[in-house]
């Protein structure tokens, strides 16, 4: 989700944004800081072993708006926020795993990853 | 148009510290970071370090922290550099320059001289 | 860091012909957003660099057309079409890609 109310046609930046980056960070990072066109992201998921994982880094403009809206998907907690207002912004975004539903316990512990979600560095 | 002004030069002794300036003005200061480039004759140009005047971030080339500290001051739209603990090898032409992705403006650069 | 190798060093033109400056980087260029992140700068005897070309191939505001810029991943190029006077000068290639940002040598464009 975006925490600074932004509108839903991204538009360039002037200067680029700075975010830290864990699990996440590209080749182009140094000291854990990416560079970003787009927004910084905090993002919590389960892994196979059904243990939360948080990740952190950039997303770059393009693709980044639908990227932000954390669409559910089915048979995968997961959640993403989104900022932009100032360099590594990301530090203070805490996402949290939406609840279990049932259906996820009748399911049993099979998670199919979506990774092209996160995954959109050009 | 966009401006950055800089001190035409600056003559100052070994040891002792100095603090540059760049007062930015035809655009909003806080929109761009504002960069530092170290020029010496027949050595290029070497990046020092940036800032973000929005919210005073800073990235350094690692061979220069601890000798630059840049600043700004928002009120008066102006960037600062102090290099500190001089040497004659900061005997250099300073320049700030503006930086969204990449330098479009340079100031006209400050020469500074270190020597007794 | 990345190192910005320029050539030639010195570059003896007449008045009308066309120069070919050549950039290469010691790392890929190509930022994680997409961008490749390679501008050329020019700096007169006694002044301050001024942008030409940004990101590969844009040309700056003001900047006449015989100045064009190409190449991709490591290794760029600056062409001027007809070289006139006022294009004397040092030519530098920088890469804003990989911090820290990095400047090659530079190459000196003078009358033959």
């Known amino acids: 989700k975006k925490e600074d109310g932004e509108s839903t046609a991204p538009t360039a930046r002037p200067k680029v944004l700075r975010c830290k980056c864990h699990h996440h960070c590209p080749e182009d990072s140094v000291n854990n800081i990416c560079s970003t066109d787009g927004y910084c992201f905090t993002m919590i998921e389960e892994d196979d072993s059904g243990t939360p994982v948080v990740t952190s880094g950039c997303l770059g403009l393009e693709g980044s708006d639908f990227q932000c809206r954390d669409t559910p998907i089915p048979h995968q907690r997961r959640s993403i926020e989104c900022c932009t207002e100032r360099n590594e912004c990301n530090k203070d975004l805490h996402p949290t795993l939406p609840p279990l539903k049932d259906r996820d316990f009748v399911d049993g512990p099979i998670h199919h990853k979506h990774h092209h979600h996160h995954h959109h560095h050009h | 148009q966009v401006q950055l002004q800089q001190p035409g030069a600056d003559l100052v002794k070994p040891g002792t510290s100095v603090k540059l300036s760049c007062k930015a003005s035809?655009?909003?200061?806080?929109?761009?970071?504002m960069q530092w480039v170290k020029q010496r004759p027949g050595q290029g140009l070497e990046w020092i370090g940036e800032?973000?005047?929005?919210?005073?971030?800073?990235m350094y080339n690692q061979k220069f922290k601890g000798k630059a500290t840049l600043t700004v001051d928002t009120s008066s739209s102006t960037a600062y550099m102090q290099l500190s603990s001089l040497t004659s090898e900061d005997s250099a032409v300073y320049y700030c320059?503006?930086?969204?992705?990449?330098?479009?403006?340079w100031g006209q650069g400050t020469t500074l001289t270190v020597s007794s | 860091d990345v190192v910005m190798t320029q050539t030639p060093l010195s570059l003896p033109v007449s008045l009308g012909d066309q120069a070919s400056i050549s950039c290469r980087s010691s790392?890929?260029?190509?930022?994680?957003?997409?961008?490749?992140?390679l501008h050329w700068y020019l700096q007169k005897a006694g002044q301050s660099p001024k942008l030409l070309i940004y990101?590969?191939?844009n040309r700056f505001s003001g900047v006449p057309d015989r100045f064009s810029g190409s190449g991709s991943g490591t290794d760029f190029t600056l062409k001027i079409s007809r070289v006139e006077a006022e294009d004397l000068g040092v030519y530098f290639c920088?890469?804003?890609?990989?911090?820290?940002?990095?400047f090659g040598s530079g190459t000196k464009l003078e009358i033959k």
């Open positions: 320059a503006r930086f969204g992705y990449y330098v479009d403006y």
């Open positions: 035809g655009y909003t200061f806080t929109s761009y970071w």
């Open positions: 800032i973000d005047p929005s919210d005073t971030y800073t």
């Open positions: 790392q890929s260029l190509v930022h994680s957003t997409g961008n490749t992140y």
């Open positions: 990101k590969v191939s």
């Open positions: 920088s890469q804003s890609t990989h911090v820290p940002f990095t």
